[in-house]
Amino acid sequence: DAHKSEVAHRFKDLGEENFKALVLIAFAQYLQQCPFEDHVKLVNEVTEFAKTCVADESAENCDKSLHTLFGDKLCTVATLRETYGEMADCCAKQEPERNECFLQHKDDNPNLPRLVRPEVDVMCTAFHDNEETFLKKYLYEIARRHPYFYAPELLFFAKRYKAAFTECCQAADKAACLLPKLDELRDEGKASSAKQRLKCASLQKFGERAFKAWAVARLSQRFPKAEFAEVSKLVTDLTKVHTECCHGDLLECADDRADLAKYICENQDSISSKLKECCEKPLLEKSHCIAEVENDEMPADLPSLAADFVESKDVCKNYAEAKDVFLGMFLYEYARRHPDYSVVLLLRLAKTYETTLEKCCAAADPHECYAKVFDEFKPLVEEPQNLIKQNCELFEQLGEYKFQNALLVRYTKKVPQVSTPTLVEVSRNLGKVGSKCCKHPEAKRMPCAEDYLSVVLNQLCVLHEKTPVSDRVTKCCTESLVNRRPCFSALEVDETYVPKEFNAETFTFHADICTLSEKERQIKKQTALVELVKHKPKATKEQLKAVMDDFAAFVEKCCKADDKETCFAEEGKKLVAASQAALGL
């Protein structure tokens, strides 16, 4: 359905408010260092132009593609070369190469100041003074820090952000009302960003086929009563939506996501019995609700998979005639029967099945060759089950903070070349799997844990890709998307690592640690732990525990002292000396 003017088409479909918000997100995700006011100016110019095209689709430049229009607009920024360096070279290219160039320069870890939350009264005043600017600023700050944030979902977050201020700025105790809501939005937002980053990495690094396989498995678990053809249609549409968002085509993405939600709700009888409530909500809530909807009940009396995929004499014929369709059917049938498996496990099983058919359907006795293929699945299923059991036991024994510390030590020994902030961030997030998933019953643990770990390890992969320092990380990140977690799990201590030179400054602490939040204080201690392991990778658990216990006691003691700074200086020296002796540094 070609439109004379793409920009007019999207403006009319989305409405002015969403159009402006999405253009702002797109621009902030591309030019992450530009000041807010510059972006607002660009967005207003694009919006005014879009309105002229709505009035007359034949007007000058209205027939240009959105990439051309947006790219031309971004390339008018005067300080492009000074602020972004080689990204300015993108502007010398023609579309579609120019957009690809902008995409390649998206920075997962931009050098931006941490967002500091002002006092509640200050925020409420700003909200009341200029609600529109306040909400735009939210979109801008999130988008520039999370250049792959799922744009239509960010609109949903902004709606909730607005609702929180609307309600809480009138409350008797504004802070008690607002702060928990903002904490929840922040945590959910980080999780949403990380989940979407994995989808984009899947599409960009491993291709559409990998993403479609993931989607078949996930949607088949969620909608086990839906026919394969229905699931396939949803997968195709969902792939288009995410391809667009990951490619910076945010207007098309939001528009297509709305169409997909509409389709799902119009056809919920043939998709899932769990959609009713979602489909009664307004658009943004509806789309979010559908994306998070619980798995439908599995149909009763599903036949054994072996009949069609092992015992049938037509296995190789069906496979050879349409490989991806046949493998898709296998994945669909397996996934709908196994909501208790992680998506990545299901994909490993499908890969094993594919590899077996590739081999056996060229063998002299194909049936004898693939007859035992399901037996090969057993160790693949048991590996994550055992790992989750062990780690949940460890988590329950240690609690979240100490479990994170155990993972910090484990991962620093595996990949000590990785930067300390990255190791701390990733290990802390890996450690959160405990409180997130270990509370679940057995049937929900694996999908919760392993699919969450895939998201966290992808953070490590994208951060490492920016400045690669470890061949082992590169290998685990690039060889196989579904085997990343087993690859990292299998890494042993890096025996080639030359321990870091001891630097007393790294272990010097000041009184400012006492005023930090509990979370920030933990991060300081965990940073020290990583550095300790980098200095002494062969240190035992017991040695490290002793040093960390001494460190905790030292912080607690000095934070209670009258002259905190002197205490930190004097006791700190003693602690460093004692630690060096304990670890033999």
Epitope: C316, A320, E358, K359, A362
Partner: antibody, heavy 118, light 106 residues
Framework: QVQLQQSGAELVRPGSSVKISCKAS????????MNWVKQRPGQGLEWIGQ????????YYNGRFKGKATLTADKSPTTAYMQLSSLTSEDSAVYVC???????????WGQGTTLTVSS | QIVLTQSPAIMSASPGEKVTMTCSAS?????MHWYQQKSGTSPKRWIY???KLASGVPVRFSGSGSGTSYSLTIRSMEAEDAATYYC?????????FGAGTKLELK
């Protein structure tokens, strides 16, 4: 491009053994069956057996069990066929061929002529 | 094992003539493949999976069949088509070849 390069012609005594090689290049050697085919002068083709270098699995034509032994080495990407207790009946051209899905042989070696004579 | 009987054993055809050779299996097979062999060279895959032409094979060739009866057809004989053609079955162990049909130019 895919190539299968076989070892040179062999003249051997009855009762002895011989090992013929087939060096593969231009494709993922581990992921395809390597088949061996016998052709006696002026006669048809006879399938001997196949080996999957990825894991060493083999299938043999019952007529050649005990006569032929198939092996493969992944590092020089080479398949081997050892023929034992040779008689004049084993004099033939032996060809290696790559097997693909649904059992056809898409690439063939140039053949190795084996002559068993006293 | 499945026995493949090719007929005729030898045939000749003039340029431009239509040629059909058959391959009959002693019991049903899943797929049939055909190879062309010229004197002093190794066989070449010619038709595979019953009806697909191998790379570089002229479109005047075609393959068809199912069950126990298969055939290779040349729509219009050309001099370069003179060779021996072997059928090979897949679907039953051991893999077997027919004795060949020798096609000569008249």
């Amino acid at each position: 491009q895919v190539q299968l390069q076989q070892s040179g012609a062999e003249l051997v005594r009855p009762g002895s053994s011989v090992k013929i090689s087939c060096k593969a290049s231009g494709y993922a050697f581990s992921n395809y069956w390597m088949n061996w085919v016998k052709q006696r002068p002026g006669q048809g083709l006879e399938w001997i057996g196949q080996i999957y270098p990825g894991d060493g699995d083999t299938y043999y034509n019952g007529r050649f069990k005990g006569k032929a032994t198939l092996t493969a080495d992944k590092s020089p990407t080479t398949a081997y066929m050892q023929l034992s207790s040779l008689t004049s009946e084993d004099s033939a051209v032996y060809v290696c061929a790559r097997g693909v899905i649904l059992g056809s042989f898409d690439y063939w070696g140039q053949g190795t002529t084996l002559t068993v004579s006293s | 094992q499945i026995v493949l009987t090719q007929s005729p054993a030898i045939m000749s055809a003039s340029p431009g003539e239509k040629v059909t050779m058959t391959c009959s299996a002693s019991s049903s097979v899943s797929y049939m493949h055909w190879y062309q062999q010229k004197s002093g060279t190794s066989p070449k895959r010619w038709i595979y999976d019953t009806s697909k032409l191998a790379s570089g094979v002229p479109v005047r060739f075609s393959g068809s069949g199912s069950g126990t009866s298969y055939s290779l057809t040349i729509r219009s004989m050309e001099a370069e088509d003179a060779a021996t053609y072997y059928c090979q079955q897949w679907g039953s162990n051991p893999l077997t070849f027919g004795a060949g049909t020798k096609l000569e130019l008249k």
